[in-house]
């Protein structure tokens, strides 16, 4: 039940051993009690004991004190449990009976007689405090106390609030006297089922399943889950957001696995060679003469450099070489001659000059011959003097270059410009390319040579009135009307009533100049726009520190690093090129990204919304101006948009809008 009415019998006095009918008990009144508890009645009536009833065994004879007994037969206080909301009022009937029969179950014995009875009616609040009372009549006296208490797990003024203390998966609490939950230390929530995480545990990046714990969501680490984990493939880098790979000093590459100081760290170059931090392996060795190999580890033949002169033959020795000189020469390299001009040592018409008072000589060679004795024929083509694939030809004392089509000059160094003959019509800009000239056409024209006027011409509809001349503007939708004498307005629609003495020539000249000026400004703007839109190929720069670039061709926004203000960002969306976007002449400032890219605002379990920033966040870029249009960079898994602010250095009128 929800509560218990408890009645403690304390003392019964029946000194004369009399029954209610005036007779006396023989040999004495063997007394037991019947208790009936019912709803409040102003006048107690017979009928069912609606709140319960109980009987005692024989507790004594005539007069006796009733001791407390917690178990077994003759339990005191008496318990009357109920399983309803306690109403706060009651009627109680206590009857004392004499039995001649069985002591243990006297209520069933025949011949029982009433000794006395008392009726109590009134109100009684639930509580632990006993209410004590004493009832007398002419023959008997009964001392007793009573109270109403709630059963285990029931609380409140009427024992109507159920609360069972627990410490399990469904809750961790004790019960307050009023039945409300009191969470055990470390737990919170309506049902005390939410643990209080370690103090300082990051609200988004961490969670806990028991008190004082801090479990990190994917990509985060540390006691408070406020430190990121670098990318899986990262080797010598750190992160400021999960899965990033920002290289430590001296390291480069996508996963920071290229040693930018390989020479210092590993000293790979042998035999005194010079090491430079470049090349496919991160280093290059420049060997000293006499050494070769990737690390200059291989010693060349000492004779490989042809040290012997004047026809001397070279012989390798263990650590050096030896020159065997032909007759007439001596010295380590056969560099000294024993001949003189008298021996006619100069060949091919060389003239001999005596040196050192006639003890040696020097030959002065005619063109096309060289060597100390003019014995070698000069090949003027050995230095590959002809550029751009020109063929070198020895022609007597000189050489000539035979140039490929499109090139000229002594060394074929001059490119014959295809643009020299101005092949581009309608003011198109000409670019010399290997396969011929390419024209960049102004607005309103197309074709290889800008010879085709785009049919969607603003002037085609004849927007100018009164015989005005129409000129197409910068874009196909723009036009300018050059008004004839006597008309004004953007379409020359308004006639002007002018006095006879009006200075027509001056006005016509003024209007003409204004129109020319407008057209000139438009052309300048157009040329500038074209130049702005052209990718700046010379200043391409390698993107370092890119992290996980594979996930569905999404750009991990915070991982883009581009310090080149004119860099164009191209996105390859695999086979489906319709998903590709190109950003030109816009700077994506890496340092702005963490602050600008918000967390996904999706409800539900943490990872769905917390794949933040450096992870696989799709970039959606749109522009509000046609000339700033940027194709969406998209993917089948685009489920969450993030905002990126793109700020143009050069075109302030282009405002890039973003979706979140």
């Amino acid at each position: 039940g929800s509560g218990i009415f408890q009645l403690r019998l304390q003392e019964f006095v029946n000194q004369r051993g009399m029954l209610a009918n005036g007779q006396s008990c023989e040999p004495g009144c063997r007394t037991f009690f019947r208790i009936c508890l019912k709803h409040f009645q102003a006048t107690f009536s017979e009928g069912p004991c609606t709140f319960g009833n109980v009987s005692t065994p024989v507790l004594g004879t005539n007069s006796f004190v009733v001791r407390d007994k917690n178990s077994g037969s003759g339990r005191n206080p008496l318990q009357l449990p109920f399983n309803f909301t306690w109403p706060g009022t009651f009627s109680l009937n206590i009857q004392a009976w004499h039995t001649p029969g069985d002591d243990l179950r006297p209520e069933t014995s025949p011949g029982n007689s009433l000794i006395s009875q008392i009726i109590i009616q009134g109100s009684l609040a639930v509580g632990k405090i006993w209410r004590t009372d004493e009832q007398n009549d002419t023959l008997t006296r009964l001392s007793y106390s009573y109270r109403v208490i709630c059963s285990d797990n029931y609380y409140g003024e009427s024992c109507s609030r159920l609360c069972k203390k627990r410490d399990d998966h469904f809750g961790h609490y004790e019960c307050q006297p009023d039945g409300s939950l009191s969470c055990l230390p470390g737990w919170t929530g309506k049902y005390c089922d939410q643990p209080i995480c370690l103090s300082g545990c990051h609200e988004q990046n961490g969670y806990c399943s028991k008190p004082d714990e801090c479990i990190c969501r994917p990509g985060w680490q540390g006691r408070l889950c406020n430190e990121c984990i670098p990318h899986n493939g990262c080797r010598h880098g750190t992160c400021s957001i999960p899965w990033q790979c920002a290289c430590d000093e001296g390291w480069g590459g996508l996963f920071c696995d290229q040693d930018l100081n390989y020479c210092t760290h590993h000293s790979p170059c042998k035999n005194g060679s010079t090491c430079s931090n470049s090349g496919p392996k991160g280093y290059t060795c420049t060997c000293l003469p006499g050494y070769t190999g990737e690390h200059c580890e291989l010693g060349l033949s000492k004779c490989a450099s042809n040290p012997c002169r004047n026809g001397g033959s070279c012989k390798d020795q263990e650590n050096s070489y030896h020159c065997l000189c032909p007759p007439g020469y001596y010295g380590q390299h056969c560099e000294h001659s024993t001949l003189t001009c008298a021996d006619s040592p100069c060949f091919n018409g060389g003239s001999c000059r005596e040196r050192n008072q006639g003890s040696s000589y020097a030959c002065e060679c005619p063109p096309n011959f060289t060597g100390s004795n003019c014995e070698k024929k000069v090949d003027r083509c050995t230095s590959n003097p002809c550029a751009n694939g020109g063929q070198c030809q020895n022609r007597g004392p000189s050489r000539t270059c035979r140039c490929r089509p499109g090139f000229t000059g002594t060394h074929c160094e001059l490119h014959i410009s295809d643009c020299a003959r101005s092949p581009c019509a309608h003011g198109g800009t000409c670019h010399d390319l290997e396969n011929g000239p390419v024209c960049t056409c102004p607005a309103g024209f197309s074709g290889r040579r800008c010879e085709v006027r785009i049919t969607h011409d603003a002037c085609a509809s004849g927007p100018c009135f009164n015989g005005a001349t129409c000129y197409t503007g910068l874009s196909p939708n723009n036009f300018v009307c050059n008004c004839p004498y006597g008309f004004v307005g953007s379409r020359c629609e308004f006639p002007v009533g002018l006095p006879p003495s009006f200075p027509w020539v001056a006005v016509s000249l003024g209007v003409g100049l204004v129109v020319l000026l407008v057209l000139l400004v438009m052309v300048v703007v157009a040329v500038r726009q074209l130049r702005l839109r052209r990718p700046d190929d010379e200043s391409r720069e390698a993107m370092n520190n890119l992290s996980d670039f594979q996930k569905d061709n999404l750009i991990p926004a915070a991982q883009l690093k581009n310090t080149n203000q004119k860099k164009e960002l191209e996105v390859d969306c695999g086979l489906d090129k319709s998903n590709c976007g190109k950003l030109q002449n816009h700077t994506l400032d890496y340092n702005l990204a963490p602050g600008l890219l918000g967390r996904g605002g999706m409800p539900g379990k943490y990872p769905h919304s917390d794949k933040s920033l450096g992870e696989k966040v799709p970039l959606r870029l749109h522009s509000e101006k046609p000339e700033c249009r940027i194709s969406a960079i998209c993917s089948p898994r685009d489920s969450m948009y993030q905002s990126v602010c793109l700020i143009s250095e050069e075109r302030n009128e282009c405002v890039i809008a973003t979706e979140v």
């Epitope: 399943s209 479990i215 990190c216 969501r217 994917p218 990509g219 985060w220 680490q221 540390g222 006691r223 430190e227 984990i229 670098p230 899986n232 493939g233 990262c234 080797r235 010598h236 880098g237 750190t238 430590d248 996980d548 996930k551 379990k605 990872p607 769905h608 794949k611 696989k616």
Partner: antibody, heavy 118, light 107 residues
């Protein structure tokens, strides 16, 4: 090239202790969280413990809590697992791995066998 | 703890075959799932992380898909070196847990 080399395994009696070491190279050890993962003979893989790179915070599977201690020495590029009060069910090949409990284990050592038997 | 169940526990296939291994999580783990390959007497090797991202140096014949509770590893054309045991692992919930493994044998 990333390399993780475990050592310290061997035969030990129940209740005994063992200390495993893992020498790391080919990456900046101090930048990355590390873990121990074990595999009982003929069985599957089981995560044992993790230590963060940032502040050395440690986590353990329930069955080894209070008996095993994971630690690291960034100056020596080394990871350790101190195993006390060993039980027969701790018998396994112990792998040192780079990763946390909430990230993939990107690199693994060759493993060291720990046999707990009387 | 999250239970990871792989199926089949073993399978036989021939070189050139297309093979699919599945992994089921007892709770939604989003895309926080990895696949590993282990050859006898060797350490496991990371193949795929975040459900579908290939680890560095892994051939493109390996691919992964799924999200939530159901995931698959596919080998488009089996090569002799692919015969091994494959494990899935979730790292969405603490503690991380592995599947029991799928042994891929030569038919």
């Amino acid at each position: 090239e990333v390399q993780l080399v475990e050592s310290g395994g061997g035969l030990v009696q129940p209740g005994g202790s063992l200390r495993l070491s893992c020498a790391a190279s080919g990456f900046t050890f101090s930048n990355f969280p590390m873990a121990w993962v074990r595999q009982a003979p003929g069985k599957g893989l089981e995560w044992v413990a993790t230590i963060s790179s940032s502040d050395g915070t440690t986590y353990y599977r329930d069955s080894v809590k209070g008996r095993f201690t994971i630690s690291r020495d960034n100056a020596k590029n080394s990871l350790y697992l101190q195993m006390n009060s060993l039980r027969a069910e701790d018998t396994a090949v112990y792998y040192c791995a780079r990763g946390y409990y909430n990230s993939p284990f990107a690199y693994w050592g060759q493993g060291t066998l720990v046999t707990v038997s009387s | 703890d999250i239970q990871m169940t792989q199926s089949p526990s073993s399978l036989s296939a021939s070189v050139g075959d297309r093979v699919t291994i599945t992994c089921r999580a007892s709770q939604d783990i989003y895309i926080n799932l990895a696949w590993y390959q282990q050859k006898p007497g060797k350490a496991p090797k990371l193949l795929i992380f975040d459900t579908s991202d290939l680890a560095d140096g892994v051939p493109s014949r390996f691919s992964g898909s799924g999200s939530g509770t159901d995931f698959t590893l596919t080998i488009s054309s089996l090569q002799p070196e692919d015969f091994a045991t494959y494990y899935c692992q979730q790292y969405d919930y603490y503690p991380p847990t592995f599947g029991q493994g799928t042994k891929l044998e030569i038919k």
